[in-house]
Interface confidence: low
């Protein structure tokens, strides 16, 4: 595993998936990111999934100090979108295309937390909500929303890795 | 059952125009979601062409169509639009509305063919 005994990670490794999954988020459903397509006065409803925020010691001098608080956030939010394209919202009716990068991008979250999870150590996951959409229509509202958040949280994910390969790497 | 139905394609010289559209059945709350229109060229992949908020405040287009195509919506008709100025012969192809941009959800299409 990259993190063994809680010591540093792979950062290059984890800097090349955490970018490929930057790639995937933005290929899994493309205008989330660069078209606004919500109302004036909409409010987002992000307040169930994970954020890195500014006491997340993902800052340059957080990470230097130890970065074990930031890397946790981030295998938190990874274990916890991974287990939302795996749930119902994604698996159950309109099924996706059969070319659809959301299998991909599954594997690749899983990939990323897994080269961040000491071994023999588990840090704890943040419960997912218990979201089960009757409606198709209600699943792709969620859909959309989950992706949103996902791809801000994974950009910000490999601004710490591209940050962490380039001044922590041994 | 939801159904979204596209109409309005058709035969068409280069430069003339079509208006399409696309009726939501069975759907409670069409002003709830933001609506595309995308496309499909012979042999080609599925492209999004055009999508419209949930109000229809907010309008985006692809390059390809920006300046001749317009979409709208009537939320009162439950009814997506695309009207298509100075059609060109690679704008042939069938045109879907859907509910997202890949086109996972979306009606049966619409034939648009532009040839003289």
């Known amino acids: 595993r990259a993190v063994p005994g809680g010591s540093s990670p792979a950062w290059t490794q984890c800097q090349q998936l955490s970018q490929k999954l930057c790639t995937l988020a933005w290929s899994a459903h493309p205008l989330v990111g660069h078209m606004d397509l919500r109302e004036e006065g909409d409010e987002e409803t992000t307040n169930d999934v994970p954020h890195i925020q500014c006491g997340d010691g993902c800052d340059p001098q957080g990470l230097r100090d130890n970065s074990q608080f930031c890397l946790q956030r981030i295998h938190q939010g990874l274990i916890f979108y991974e287990k939302l394209l795996g749930s119902d919202i994604f698996t159950g009716e309109p099924s996706l295309l059969p070319d659809s990068p959301v299998g991909q991008l599954h594997a690749s979250l899983l990939g990323l937390s897994q080269l961040l999870q000491p071994e023999g150590h588990h840090w704890e996951t943040q419960q997912i909500p218990s979201l089960s959409p009757s409606q198709p229509w209600q699943r792709l509202l969620l859909r959309f929303k989950i992706l949103r958040s996902l791809q801000a949280f994974v950009a910000v994910a490999a601004r710490v890795f591209a940050h962490g390969a380039a001044t922590l790497s041994p | 059952e939801v159904q979204l139905v596209e109409s309005g394609g058709g035969l068409v010289q280069p430069g003339g125009s079509l208006r399409l559209s696309c009726e939501a059945s069975a759907l409670t709350s069409f002003s709830n979601y933001a609506m595309y229109w995308v496309r499909q060229a012979p042999g080609k992949a599925l492209e999004w062409v055009s999508a419209?908020?949930?109000?229809?405040?907010?309008?985006y287009y692809a390059d390809s169509v920006k300046g001749r195509f317009t979409i709208s919506r009537d939320n009162a008709k439950d009814t997506l639009y695309l009207q298509m100025n100075s059609l060109r012969s690679e704008d042939t192809g069938v045109y879907y509305c859907a509910v997202d941009s890949s086109g996972t959800w979306r009606g049966q299409g619409t034939q648009v063919t532009v040839s003289s």
């Open positions: 419209i908020s949930r109000a229809g405040s907010n309008t």
